[in-house]
Amino acid sequence: DAHKSEVAHRFKDLGEENFKALVLIAFAQYLQQCPFEDHVKLVNEVTEFAKTCVADESAENCDKSLHTLFGDKLCTVATLRETYGEMADCCAKQEPERNECFLQHKDDNPNLPRLVRPEVDVMCTAFHDNEETFLKKYLYEIARRHPYFYAPELLFFAKRYKAAFTECCQAADKAACLLPKLDELRDEGKASSAKQRLKCASLQKFGERAFKAWAVARLSQRFPKAEFAEVSKLVTDLTKVHTECCHGDLLECADDRADLAKYICENQDSISSKLKECCEKPLLEKSHCIAEVENDEMPADLPSLAADFVESKDVCKNYAEAKDVFLGMFLYEYARRHPDYSVVLLLRLAKTYETTLEKCCAAADPHECYAKVFDEFKPLVEEPQNLIKQNCELFEQLGEYKFQNALLVRYTKKVPQVSTPTLVEVSRNLGKVGSKCCKHPEAKRMPCAEDYLSVVLNQLCVLHEKTPVSDRVTKCCTESLVNRRPCFSALEVDETYVPKEFNAETFTFHADICTLSEKERQIKKQTALVELVKHKPKATKEQLKAVMDDFAAFVEKCCKADDKETCFAEEGKKLVAASQAALGL
């Protein structure tokens, strides 16, 4: 399937609009600090070049790889050294090292200003004045803040973004129409970014085998009627798509994702009965719909797993002949029978099974040795079940905000060295598991909760990797992808931590807090809570609760005062003194 000109091939496959959008995303994900106008200029230059190659594939430089073409273009940026420092050294390298170098410099937490949403009328005017620039700006702003965002999915978000403005800017009440849609896109976008970040971490830190195992388990749950060979083919194709996107090969990724959607829809009879509606949609919606499709019904009368994987005398023979294929079959068979298990639990079971076979197939009596392997699964299944039950009870008792606070305290005591903004962000997201998953019936709780927690803990891992401060975090993040959550759950209070010096400035608040949204106010309070625990790690729940009660009362009182600033100054001093006394600081 070799083409004389790769750039011409992708331009023709994707069309000009998608080509330009994907190149913009790719450039913004690599050079996250560059101004919008600079990126647009680079994209236009690449697009003009691609058109010359479409006209004549033999034209000069048209035979170069996309990495070479894109890398050369990025390296023309004049301010590379002053803006990006050592990333400029990448330009001295040859492909493929140069692209690897750019990938290594992607920043999960770039120092960029928070996106402030302008007034609705201002946005609608900008949209009408120049729709194309407005939508490009959206792609650019999201891509540079989320350097691993799944590019073809970002095109889908941009399409919805455009539809929202097209509809709402003509509405009688523009704000009532638009703002909920933008909120939904923002929340879904953050979730989508985090899910993709885990896929990329899985591929980059744990390798293709780890990602394929994840994909076998998930697709087997989703498509339990599909044959193992069919699932294997989908896994291979899906792995290629995500490897490309995580590697910055966005044109190939989008093209291959479209091919995969086409294949799935052409073969839906042998894949799943739930795909019909998805397959009637246009490309971007179709791919999104397939990725989110509900699990198909399990085939009736599936035989017991024990027959093939425990009772059979050929277990070791089958395992030895093709280890990964046999383990893949085990995972497929287990997963299609257990939509009620999280993917990470299924992978733990498969790992336990693999370890048992490795040990037992070398033993004198293999069958006797592995006969009880399924008994080893029981505690592995019960651990997440019990944890989810306890935490859902706590969530139902406390509500989301106070549940987040309980997790903030719990995680700050486990890993107090982690930065306060990271602890707040991660704990807030961990706390969202309650409203997201506890409403589900038992059969859907574990896959919802534990797989979501894997995504959130990966956020902690990637943020911590940028500036490592805790050996415990590094250990939990790097030892085993599927055991990250149990590893963090098992951490107790860090007894080696030396409490932070008390700094009254940390607990000094001003009248500007009164104009913040409820969410931003919560974040302020939760930031203070983390700092309190860092000062006094041995503080009891009751002590912390009292201080948090006071903080809420303090903000409420001073925000209602005539002279807010004086109230914050005077009452703040008293609050700090009382809190210090209560906590024995």
């Epitope: 009292a546 009660d549 006071d550 009362a553 303090f554 609050l575 003194a577 009382a578 809190s579 209560a582």
Partner: nanobody, 123 residues
Framework: EVQLVESGGGLVQAGGSLRLSCAAS????????MGWFRQAPGKQREYVAV???????YYTNSAKGRFTISRDNAENTVYLQMNSLKPEDTAVYFC?????????????????WGQGTQVTVSS
């Protein structure tokens, strides 16, 4: 002018019960944390129980399980139900109001105090 008036004290036998009341006036009662304190002869004033403006309750170890603090925002009153009383509970019981739970717990610059009511537990 803010006033806190305690009532309900008296003489009671060990093992008995009493219910103290504290009626507040001149302040936005529902916005304040309210607390009960006691002072035995020759001893320092100590905190017994606190209820926050959001109805969260806090007790000292000696009060836990025996005493219950509650509030009625409509009546601007805070209560202390004392059961299983012991001779060592003998003291003058004071009611106080402050914006902050921790100020009450640690007796830090407390805004408003009542005059107190005597509780005597005989053996």
């Amino acid at each position: 002018e803010v006033q806190l008036v305690e009532s309900g004290g008296g003489l009671v036998q060990a093992g008995g019960s009493l219910r103290l009341s504290c009626a507040a006036s001149g302040l936005s009662f529902s916005r304040y944390a309210m607390g009960w304190f006691r002072q035995a002869p020759g001893k320092q004033r100590e905190y017994v129980a606190v209820i926050s403006s959001s109805d969260t309750t806090y007790y000292t170890n000696s009060a836990k399980g025996r005493f219950t603090i509650s509030r009625d925002n409509a009546e601007n009153t805070v209560y202390l139900q004392m059961n299983s009383l012991k001779p060592e509970d003998t003291a003058v019981y004071f009611c106080a109001a402050d914006s902050f739970v921790t100020a009450l717990q640690t007796l830090t610059q407390i805004n408003y105090w009542g005059q107190g009511t005597q509780v005597t537990v005989s053996s």
